[in-house]
C-alpha cells in the first residue's frame, strides 16, 4: 500500500522563500539527506541551477498540490529560467519517493528546437546523486 | 514472488540487545519501505518504524526512538532491526513488511531473567 | 495517537453468511493529498498478518472480491459478502495517516 510521499528536503542558503511548510520534516540526523513527508501533495520537486556545465541543487522538497509531470516515476528536469547571463534553471516533478534526490540528465538549457550546450550527463543506466 | 525472510527465534535476559534481521527477496529491494511491527502475546499489533533502503532514511514511534535502530545491507537485500535495553514486555513476535503488503514470518523475542 | 476502535470484538458467523466488521477512528484519516490511508489484515491462526485493503476500499491482489472495504473520514466498515472456512482469523483495521500509525484491537471472527 501506498506511504505518504516522502521527498528529499533541501534550501541553499539565500533562496527566498521557503517550502518547509509543505510537509513534515523527518528526524533523520546529520549524515543522511533530509527527507520531508508531503502534506498536501504526493509530488516532489526539484530545482537545478545550471552554470557553465555545473549545477548545483537550489531546492528540492514538496508540491502543494499534484500537477501535471507529477505522475513521473523519476526526475526528468526541463529548463524554466534564466536568474542570470549563463545559468538556467531546471525544475523537475515526480510522484515516487525520493524522486527528487537526482535526475539522470539535464536537456540543454536552450528552448526547445534551440541548437544549446548539453547539461552534464549522466552515464547511460546511470544516476547522478546530487551531493546535499 | 516477494518474500521476506526474518532470522531465528531469540532469549535474552533484560537489558540486553536484540538484533534481528529480515532477507528480501523477489522485488527491487531498494524501491519500497521496509515497516517494523510487533505483537506482544495476546495482543494486537503495534508498529515501530520504517526504513527506505535506498537511502537509509527511517521515521519511528516515538515510544521506540532511542532504543531501535533500523539499518539495511542493499548488497544483500536485507533489513535488520536492533532494540536496545530489552524490558519483559519486549516479549513479543517482531515481523519485517514490505510496506505492509507482504510480510516475514516473525521473530519470537521472549525476555526474561 | 489516533484509537482505532473495532466493534464487534468477537464475530460468529454461518458459513455462506456475510459479515461486517467496523473501524472508527479517532482522528479523521482523510490526508491532505486527498487519500485515505486506511488499511484491513487477516491474522489466521498461527500466521503473519496479511493485505487485505488499502486505501479504504481497493484490494490486494489475490484477495477474493467477496472482501469490500468502504467507509470515509472517521468510520469505516470491511464487509465479507459470504463467509467462507478460510476466512477465520482476527481481522485488524490500521491507519498510516497519522504518526505513529496504529492498528485497531482486532476482530476475532469464528465459524458459527
Known amino acids: 500500500p501506498p506511504n505518504r510521499r516522502t521527498c528529499v528536503f533541501f534550501e541553499a542558503p539565500g533562496v527566498r522563500g521557503s517550502t518547509k511548510t509543505l510537509g513534515e520534516l523527518l528526524d533523520t540526523g546529520t549524515e543522511l539527506p533530509r527527507a520531508i513527508r508531503c502534506l498536501y501533495s504526493r509530488c516532489c520537486f526539484g530545482i537545478w541551477n545550471l552554470t557553465q556545465d555545473r549545477a548545483q541543487v537550489e531546492m528540492q522538497g514538496c508540491r502543494d498540490s499534484d500537477e501535471p509531470g507529477c505522475e513521473s516515476l523519476h526526475c526528468d528536469p526541463s529548463p524554466r529560467a534564466h536568474p542570470s547571463p549563463g545559468s538556467t534553471l531546471f525544475t523537475c516533478s515526480c510522484g515516487t519517493d525520493f524522486c527528487n534526490a537526482n535526475y539522470s540528465h539535464l536537456p540543454p538549457p536552450g528552448s526547445p528546437g534551440t541548437p544549446g550546450s548539453q547539461g552534464p550527463q549522466a552515464a547511460p543506466g546511470e544516476s547522478i546523486w546530487m551531493a546535499l | 514472488q516477494v518474500q521476506l525472510v526474518q532470522s531465528g527465534a531469540e532469549v535474552k535476559v533484560p537489558g540486553a540487545s536484540v538484533k534481528m534481521s529480515c532477507k528480501a527477496s523477489?522485488?527491487?529491494?531498494?524501491?519500497?519501505?521496509v515497516s517494523w511491527v510487533r505483537q506482544s502475546p495476546g495482543q494486537g499489533l503495534e508498529w515501530i518504524g520504517e526504513?527506505?533502503?535506498?537511502?537509509?532514511?527511517?521515521n519511528f514511534n516515538e515510544k521506540f526512538k532511542g532504543r531501535v535502530t533500523l539499518t539495511v545491507d542493499k548488497s544483500t537485500s536485507t533489513a535488520y532491526m536492533e532494540l536496545r535495553s530489552l524490558r519483559s514486555d519486549d516479549t513479543a513476535v517482531y515481523y519485517c513488511?514490505?510496506?505492509?503488503?507482504?510480510w516475514g514470518q516473525g521473530v519470537l523475542v521472549t525476555v526474561s531473567s | 495517537d489516533v484509537v482505532m476502535t473495532q466493534s464487534p470484538l468477537s464475530l460468529p458467523v454461518t458459513l455462506g453468511q456475510p459479515a461486517s466488521i467496523s473501524c472508527r477512528s479517532s482522528?479523521?484519516?482523510?490526508?491532505?493529498?486527498?487519500?485515505?490511508?486506511l488499511e484491513w489484515y487477516l491474522q489466521r491462526p498461527g500466521q503473519s498478518p496479511r493485505l487485505l485493503i488499502y486505501?479504504?476500499?481497493n484490494r490486494f491482489s489475490g484477495v477474493p472480491d467477496r472482501f469490500i472495504g468502504s467507509g470515509s473520514g472517521t468510520d469505516f466498515t470491511l464487509k465479507i459478502s459470504r463467509v467462507e472456512a478460510e476466512d477465520v482469523g482476527v481481522y485488524y483495521c490500521?491507519?498510516?495517516?497519522?504518526?505513529?500509525?496504529?492498528f485497531g484491537a482486532g476482530t476475532k471472527l469464528e465459524i458459527k
Open positions: 513488511t514490505r510496506q505492509r503488503d507482504y
Open positions: 523477489g522485488y527491487t529491494f531498494t524501491d519500497y519501505w
Open positions: 526504513i527506505y533502503p535506498k537511502n537509509g532514511v527511517s
Open positions: 482522528q479523521s484519516l482523510e490526508y491532505g493529498d486527498g487519500y485515505t490511508y
Open positions: 486505501g479504504v476500499s
Open positions: 490500521f491507519q498510516a495517516t497519522h504518526d505513529p500509525n496504529t
